[in-house]
């Protein structure tokens, strides 16, 4: 038998909150559990769904979840079925609504001394408790001639008088929560002695020096007073006009006339009506001076034939808002057709070449008129005047490739070299007519070139192959001065290129032949073991049939690398004494010695009286000062190599000898003393 271990039970629930109806069964076989609501099966949704055997509610809904729920367990094999006890929700809720007029039937029927009933359409369960408000202030029972039942949703005013006028709102609360009226009711009960608006002044826009009229009328019993004020609360009357309102006239019917309006007259005017009773009624209107700004410039436009294009005219800022229209050849454009005006836009449908020309946008208001022209060009596809042709260009000379085309507007020409866009630099120049100039043609310029001539209407292109007629040249040119280390192997390369592969040979500049230990192998001069007799001038000669021969002269120096015979040592010297930094170097060619102190080269011609560099390279500094301290670098260099060595110089104060020290006591440092 199927047994319910847990059965659903009726319970309180809150609108929009979670809830759970529990159901647990025990049975010998496999059972299938489902739920019924008022006898109909419950379908799972995101809001309400089965969770195990229980029914879970993500958000209780007072409309969809009202009724009786029942848990049903069924054994599909035996057909046995068991049903739980019924369960339902006591759903607590509250929902806002408007304040509405219940009696009389319409607002038009509200008269002084009649009964007025307002109803608060806030509903809820349990039944809410209501509170009424006038102009935000709570109303209590029996207050000022009105009967209020806070248990009820009705507010009765009997009888209703002008003092009951105001904005009525209500709030209600119950166990679920609180809500206030979604729409409030304004009760307006006229008092004959209150000033009432008959004709309100309207904002006015006038051109400078024109006239402006404000109308204003109130009614009341007895008739009300009417007064005009301007901006700074200055009263305007026919007897006392403020200085800046000399041309103001107030008529008997309340209208205000301003003549020959100036900018200082612009501003807010107030018309005030005061009845025998009640508050003053203040009406405002603004006098604006008409104005119109300049229009922004149009960029020239280029369109293609057959397309549809639009040009928007941004109206200038102005008061009142300017009206806008387009003209072409002095004629206003229609609002339909192939070329027409739509709103502020100029529309050109299926553009023809004949549509090219100047179109004018006009804007006008009370303050005046503005206009702005736009130049419209109808683009055409370029046509050839001269295509680029396959060319032979000489290396080292300028070369030209032509790409001459014509179109409207003037076409732009770009060149590609091996499919790569050519950007103008010191070697490539594209002239205004599209011709490409290659300055100083190089061998690798021999490739495909393509020019593309374009307008917005389309483009044409053509390509040409460039063949470079290579000049006879050394690649690279041999260094004119080269050094070889004595008694070492050395090579001096020489290579050349030309239209035909050149032959290369070396010879001594004096014409003598190369000694047997020096070989010339395909342009590389090879010294197996450099002797001093190998020093001198050599010539590399490159030649071919069509281009003749070229020569490169090389002076070879036989060198012995620089060695320091004497290097400067770390030296400490008393202030005021003399410092000697020794440096001797030898090498072949004989090296020159330079000194660097404090990161600057010491120029022997600008050393001053305290410093001196001897012939042998040693540096002497007399009368040393603390600022002479630092690193000193001896640099030995010749035309073949350079070497340097450095040592620090420390300048110290001479210590005051203590009594215990004899005259022969050694100084506390390894010193140079003079």
């Amino acid at each position: 038998a199927i047994v319910f271990i847990k059965q659903p039970s009726s319970q309180d629930a809150l609108q929009g909150r979670r809830a759970l109806l529990r159901c647990e069964v025990e049975a010998p076989g496999l059972v299938h559990v489902y739920w019924l609501l008022d006898g109909a099966p419950v379908q799972d949704t995101e809001r309400r769904f089965t969770q195990g055997s229980s029914l879970s509610f993500a958000a209780v809904d007072r409309l969809q979840d009202s009724g009786t729920f029942q848990c049903v367990a069924r054994d599909d094999v035996t057909g046995e079925e068991a049903r739980s006890a019924n369960a339902s929700f006591n759903i607590k809720w509250i929902e806002a609504g408007p304040v509405v007029l219940k009696h009389p039937a319409s607002e038009a029927e509200i008269q002084p001394q009649t009964q007025v009933t307002l109803r608060c359409h806030i509903d809820g369960h349990p039944r809410p408790t209501y509170q009424w408000f006038r102009d935000g202030t709570p109303l209590s029972d029996g207050q000022s001639n009105n009967t209020v039942s806070s248990k009820e949703r009705n507010l009765t005013l009997r009888p209703a008088g002008p003092e009951h006028s105001g904005l009525y709102s209500c709030c209600a609360h119950n166990a679920f929560g609180q809500a206030c009226s979604s729409q409030n009711f304004t009760l307006s009960i006229a008092d004959e002695s209150f000033a009432r608006v008959v004709l309100a002044p309207q904002d006015v826009i006038v051109a400078r020096n024109e006239e402006a009229m404000f109308h204003c009328q109130f009614s009341a019993q007895p008739p009300p007073n009417l007064q005009w004020l301007f901006e700074d609360e200055t009263p305007i009357t026919n007897r006392s006009r403020p200085p800046h309102l000399r041309r103001a006239t107030v008529f008997a019917n309340g209208s205000l006339l301003l003549t020959q309006v100036r900018p200082r007259n612009a501003g807010v005017y107030r018309c005030i009506g005061q009845g025998q009773r009640g508050p003053p009624v203040i009406l405002e209107a603004t006098l604006h001076l008409a104005e119109i700004e300049d229009m922004p410039l149009f960029e020239p436009r280029v369109f293609t034939a057959g397309s549809e294009e639009r040009v928007t005219c941004l109206p200038p800022k102005g008061l009142p808002e300017p009206s806008v229209w387009w003209e072409h050849a002095g004629v206003r454009l229609p609002t339909h057709g192939r070329v027409y005006q739509k709103g502020h836009e100029l529309v050109l449908a299926s553009i023809a070449e004949s549509d090219a020309g100047v179109y004018t946008c006009h804007a006008a208001n009370l303050a005046g008129q503005r206009r702005q022209d736009v130049n419209i060009t109808v683009a055409t596809v370029p046509t050839w005047l001269k295509k680029p042709q396959d060319s032979q260009l000489e290396e080292g000379k300028p070369g030209y490739l032509h790409c001459l085309t014509q179109a409207t507007p003037k076409p732009t020409v770009v060149w590609y070299r091996n499919q790569m866009l050519i950007s103008e630099d010191s070697r490539f120049e594209v002239f205004k007519n599209g011709t490409l100039r290659i300055n100083n043609v190089e061998v690798y310029d021999g490739t495909w070139y393509r020019c593309v001539s374009s307008t917005p209407a389309g483009s044409i292109e053509a390509q040409a192959r460039v063949q470079v007629l290579e000049k006879l040249k050394f690649t690279p040119p041999p260094q004119p001065q080269q050094c070889m280390e004595f008694d070492k192997e050395a090579t001096v390369p020489c290579s050349a290129t030309g239209r035909e592969k050149p032959t290369i040979k070396w010879e001594r500049a004096d014409g003598s032949s190369l000694p047997e230990w020096v070989t010339d192998n395909a342009g590389t001069l090879h010294f197996a073991r450099v002797t001093r007799d190998d020093a001198g001038n050599y010539t590399c000669i490159a030649s071919n049939g069509p281009q003749g021969q070229i020569r490169a002269h090389v002076q070879l120096t036989v060198a012995v690398f620089i060695t320091f015979k004497v290097e400067p040592e770390r030296t400490t010297v008393y202030q005021g004494h003399t410092a000697l930094l020794q440096c001797e170097a030898q090498g072949d060619p004989k090296p020159l010695i330079q000194w660097k102190g404090k990161d600057r080269i010491l120029d022997p011609t600008k050393l001053g009286p305290r410093m001196h560099i001897f012939q042998n390279g040693s540096l002497v500094i007399h009368d040393v000062a603390p600022e002479d301290s630092g690193r000193y670098t001896c640099i030995a260099g010749n035309s073949c190599n350079i070497k340097h060595t450095e040592a620090p110089l420390y300048v110290v104060d001479k210590p005051v000898p203590e009594e215990s020290e004899g005259p022969g006591s050694p100084p506390p440092y390894k010193m140079i003393q003079t």
């Epitope: 280390e485 004595f486 008694d487 070492k488 073991r529 002797t531 001093r532 007799d533 020093a535 001198g536 120096t557 036989v558 012995v560 690398f561 620089i562 060695t563 320091f564 015979k565 290097e567 030898q586 090498g587 072949d588 060619p589 004989k590």
Partner: antibody, heavy 120, light 113 residues
Framework: QVQLVESGGGVVQPGRSLRLSCAAS????????MHWVRQAPGKGLEWVAV????????YYADSVKGRFIISRDNSRDTLYLQMNSLRAEDTAVYYC?????????????WGQGTLVTVSS | DIVMTQSPDSLAVSLGERATINCKSS????????????LAWYQQKPGQPPNLLIY???TRESGVPDRFSGSGSGTDFTLTISSLQAEDVAVYYC?????????FGGGTKVEIK
């Protein structure tokens, strides 16, 4: 002050080997070329071999080529001469000499020498 | 190889007198690039290693007395001791360092008469 001290000399039979060393001090050994020069008893001076400051080049007199090997260890400031297949005519005082620079073949400092006697 | 020939083989000179030693090279040792003669003179006293006296044919090594002087150019060179002193008794060698291998003269023995 520059000092060169040779060692490793002695009496050796023909065809045998001997290794001479020269310990250097008082200068930057790795900046100078180094040579071996020999002097047979009662005879003049004969240049034997050179090694450059960096050990990159080595040259020999024709009389010892293929038998003697010059080498140096700049980290130990030491020069070596490996003498193989010694002959009677190799008998001499062997001097280690410093080059005037890197490769001048001019000798500004000499060691006291070590005597090598090749005799059966 | 450049052959160096010294003369005389030996020389006896009175104390305070001038001694002159000659050296001849089989090839020019004057280097045109710097106009220097690649020739040196050494002094070897009995039981001692040689000692550099003069290089560039005429430049005295530091510490060498000025009574020693060198001269000559190209292939012919001379070492002169202007006033012989007792400590100058030695064998004197010339050497070329113009080309490899470096070669020495046979030596000149200087004695006191």
């Amino acid at each position: 002050q520059v000092q060169l001290v040779e060692s490793g000399g002695g009496v050796v039979q023909p065809g045998r080997s001997l290794r001479l060393s020269c310990a250097a001090s008082g200068f930057t050994f790795s900046s100078y070329g180094m040579h071996w020069v020999r002097q047979a008893p009662g005879k003049g001076l004969e240049w034997v071999a050179v090694i450059w400051y960096d050990g990159g080049n080595k040259y020999y007199a024709d009389s010892v080529k293929g038998r003697f090997i010059i080498s140096r260890d700049n980290s130990r400031d030491t020069l070596y001469l490996q003498m193989n297949s010694l002959r009677a005519e190799d008998t001499a005082v062997y001097y280690c000499a410093r080059d005037w620079g890197s490769s001048w073949y001019l000798f500004d400092h000499w060691g006291q020498g070590t005597l090598v006697t090749v005799s059966s | 190889d450049i052959v160096m020939t010294q003369s005389p083989d030996s020389l006896a000179v009175s104390l305070g007198e001038r001694a002159t030693i000659n050296c001849k090279s089989s090839q020019n040792v004057l280097y045109s690039s710097n106009n220097e003669n690649y020739l040196a003179w050494y002094q070897q006293k009995p039981g001692q290693p040689p000692n550099l006296l003069i290089y560039w044919a005429s430049t005295r090594e530091s510490g060498v007395p000025d009574r020693f002087s060198g001269s000559g150019s190209g292939t012919d060179f001379t070492l002169t001791i202007s006033s012989l002193q007792a400590e100058d008794v030695a064998v004197y060698y010339c050497q070329q360092y113009y080309s490899t291998p470096p070669t020495f003269g046979g030596g000149t023995k200087v004695e006191i008469k």
